[in-house]
Interface confidence: low
């Protein structure tokens, strides 16, 4: 089963700024990536960004910068100011659609005792759920 990994990191320079990285370990081509917070999109979560390989990228506050890192991974920077800013225990979810193979989703949050800037290195990325 293809797997999705999610990494959440608090930036050392801006304590209210988060970076979310997600990747798809399957072999199919990706048709759409949806990033949400507060739970999966459509299950109580709120969409932060949608990335389409051809049509481009759309993002909503407090998302500041969403981009493709590779053909199968994305990153998203969140601005942490105002009422809609994330907190340390916020859950972030990524859903990769790869038709007709199916769609896969994973969620993650900051490690419980993570110091800013000291979260797990990008390789190997933590696989949180193959779903």
């Amino acid at each position: 089963t293809p797997e999705v990994w999610v990494q959440v990191r608090m930036e050392a320079t801006e304590l209210s700024s988060f970076t979310i990285r997600c990747g798809f370990l399957g072999s199919g081509s990706i048709s759409l990536v949806t990033v949400s917070w507060g739970g999966p999109n459509g299950a109580g979560g709120t969409t932060l960004a949608v990335l389409h390989p051809e049509r481009g990228i759309r993002q909503w506050a407090p998302a500041r910068q969403a981009r493709w890192e590779t053909q199968s991974s994305i990153s998203l920077i969140l601005e942490g100011s105002g009422a809609s800013s994330p907190c340390a225990n916020t859950t972030f979810c990524c859903k990769f659609a790869s038709f007709p193979e199916g769609s896969w989703e994973a969620c993650g949050s900051l490690p419980p005792s993570s110091d800013p800037g000291l979260s797990a290195p990008p390789t190997p990325a933590p696989i949180l759920r193959a779903d």
């Epitope: 089963t1 293809p2 048709s31 759409l32 949806t34 999966p40 999109n41 459509g42 299950a43 969409t47 949608v50 389409h52 051809e54 049509r55 759309r58 659609a97 038709f99 007709p100 193979e101 199916g102 769609s103 896969w104 989703e105 759920r129 193959a130 779903d131």
Partner: antibody, heavy 115, light 107 residues
Framework: EVQLVESGGGLVKPGGSLRLSCAAS????????ISWVRQAPGKGLEWVSE????????YYPDTVTGRFTISRDNAKNTLYLQMSSLRAEDTAVYYC????????WGQGTLVTVSS | DIQMTQSPSSLSASVGDRVTITCKAS??????VAWYQQKPGKAPKLLIY???YRFTGVPSRFSGSGSGTDFTLTISSLQPEDFATYYC?????????FGGGTKVEIK
């Protein structure tokens, strides 16, 4: 060959409950998100619920949230829809469908809610 | 929720005709639109996904186009087996939503 076979439909009184099943074969069931889609007599298609491949994530429209529960047993290659507090407007043919969008469909099972 | 408005709701055509069905989304869905064909008493069949990709086994006379909010299904030369009801659907976000359907009848 991909096959989806629904069962469990029938006549139920308003306020009653029913559990639908969808038996899958011909593909790796645990690798796919599966949905239920319904069609009231003479009407269009309405998506009712979706469950992710491992069963962790579930989705519902407002019309059935709190009344319907989707689940799956990947060991048995079977999808379920538990329906409670049924209303007359839930009368429809219920289809299970694989993928996102829906590449393969079952033949449907009729649910009639009437007193 | 994203509304999908399909038109016309029905049309009459002859074998060999070129038929066009349109679908308008209430907001931008990029290219995440699918088209289905349904015959009476049968389950729907996927024809087109992601706006323009034909699903396995779908004849080349079926094609899809559009992006953003406006989408089109075209049958280049209508065949007797094509008389059916057609639905568009957005697979951009949850809840998944369908158009109201277009019934293609024999003239």
């Amino acid at each position: 060959e991909v096959q989806l076979v629904e069962s469990g439909g029938g006549l139920v009184k308003p306020g009653g409950s029913l559990r639908l099943s969808c038996a899958a074969s011909g593909f790796t069931f645990s690798s796919y998100g599966i949905s239920w889609v319904r069609q009231a007599p003479g009407k269009g298609l309405e998506w009712v619920s979706e469950i992710s491949s491992g069963g962790t994530y579930t989705y519902y429209p407002d019309t059935v949230t709190g009344r319907f529960t989707i689940s799956r047993d990947n060991a048995k290659n079977t999808l379920y829809l538990q329906m409670s507090s049924l209303r007359a407007e839930d009368t429809a043919v219920y289809y299970c469908a694989r993928g996102d969008p829906f590449g393969y469909w079952g033949q449907g099972t009729l649910v009639t809610v009437s007193s | 929720d994203i509304q999908m408005t399909q038109s016309p709701s029905s049309l009459s055509a002859s074998v060999g005709d070129r038929v066009t069905i349109t679908c308008k989304a209430s907001q931008d869905v990029m290219t995440a639109v699918a088209w289905y064909q349904q015959k009476p008493g049968k389950a729907p069949k996927l024809l087109i996904y992601s706006t323009s990709y034909r699903f396995t086994g779908v004849p080349s006379r079926f094609s899809g186009s559009g992006s953003g909010t406006d989408f089109t299904l075209t049958i280049s030369s209508l065949q007797p087996e094509d008389f059916a009801t057609y639905y568009c659907q957005q697979h951009y976000s949850t809840p998944r939503t369908f158009g109201g359907g277009t019934k293609v009848e024999i003239k």
